[in-house]
């Protein structure tokens, strides 16, 4: 077992708003559970946008899920990772981190 | 270390306004995690009332309708509740709690108010 | 709303066994779960959270598992001190909803 290393990043999105992206990469097996949490449960899955898990040449695999926020909501969102029976919350940066 | 911890009276009315207040040490209420109500009725059920949020916004429990508000007052570093038009079976021991954002689970709770609802 | 169902609603052990109580959800919540442990006029105390994971200082015979809606809290050679009432917590969306508990007796 590689467990992922996760990461999230901001980017600015139509004014007010803020896409938040949560990546996973450098795991093995492949099966990983990576979602946003919003208040401290599930957001619901038609607002979050999942990428594929993928292959990344290194007998590893990535992938990731994005949501769109409000712009200084930042801090009601983390994103939830769960891999190989481990898991972990990681919360949005803060702006200019 | 935080310390959350509960105040109001023990006897309320019927058709009365139940109002509690919850006084928080060692954390601001406004720096982060969400400020809970709790409710146990006698028999032992819990049920999540609603809470406050470090933003100040609310969500509360759909069963309690329009009869409950959570407010805060950030300078005292105190959260409230007020539950309007009380019944004998809003009768339970209160508790209020914190949780984070990682997960809504409650580490972190005041001891009970017991809240008798009675003529 | 999602439903919690605790079973059993009592029981009785001695010390040194092995207790299971289990937690029904009324829809799938995805490991969205917490277990409390609540003594006689006191407050609930955290035990699990993510349905997996021990809370700070909780002493390892406690162990939770399950997946989908199907959870359980194992409590290996049970002690003395681990008397008391017992619930689940989902926090997969709001409403918020605990389990009715089940009472651990020492026999």
């Known amino acids: 077992t590689v467990p992922p290393m996760v990461n999230v990043t901001r980017s600015e999105a139509s004014e007010g708003n803020i896409t938040v992206t949560c990546r996973a990469s450098s795991f093995y097996p492949r099966n990983i559970i990576l979602t946003w949490r919003q208040d401290g449960v599930s957001l619901s899955h038609d607002t979050q946008q999942w990428g594929d898990v993928l292959p990344d040449g290194n007998g590893t695999y990535q992938t990731w899920v994005a949501t769109r926020i409000c712009r200084g909501e930042e801090q009601r969102f983390t994103c939830y990772m769960e891999h190989s029976g481990n898991h972990s919350t990681h919360p949005v940066p803060s702006n200019g981190s | 270390d935080v310390q959350l911890q509960g105040s109001g009276p023990g006897l309320v009315k019927p058709s009365q306004s139940l109002s509690l207040t919850c006084s928080v040490t060692?954390?601001?209420?406004?720096?982060?995690y969400y400020w809970n109500w709790i409710r146990q009725f006698p028999g032992n059920k819990l049920e999540w009332m609603?809470?406050?949020?470090?933003?100040?916004?609310?969500n509360y429990n759909p069963s309690l309708k329009n009869r409950i508000s959570i407010t805060r007052d950030t300078s005292k570093n105190q959260f409230f509740l007020k539950l309007s038009s009380v019944t004998t079976e809003d009768t339970a021991t209160y508790y209020c709690?914190?949780?984070d954002g990682r997960g809504a689970w409650f580490a972190y709770w005041a001891q009970g108010t017991l809240v008798t609802v009675s003529a | 709303d999602i439903q919690m169902t605790q079973s059993p609603a009592s029981l009785s052990a001695s010390v040194g066994e092995t207790v299971t109580i289990t937690c029904r959800a009324s829809?799938?919540?995805?490991?969205?779960l917490a277990w409390y442990q609540q003594k006689q006029g006191k407050s609930p105390q955290l035990l699990v959270y993510?349905?997996?994971t021990l809370a700070d200082g909780v002493p390892s015979r406690f162990s939770g598992s399950g997946s989908g809606t199907q959870y359980s809290l194992k409590i290996n050679s049970l002690q003395p001190e681990d008397f008391g009432n017992y619930y689940c917590?989902?926090?997969?969306?709001?409403?918020?909803?605990f389990g009715a508990g089940t009472k651990v007796e020492i026999k």
């Open positions: 709690a914190r949780y």
């Open positions: 060692g954390y601001s209420i406004t720096n982060d």
């Open positions: 609603g809470f406050i949020s470090f933003g100040g916004s609310n």
């Open positions: 829809g799938n919540i995805h490991n969205y």
């Open positions: 993510d349905a997996i």
């Open positions: 917590q989902h926090f997969w969306s709001f409403p918020l909803t």
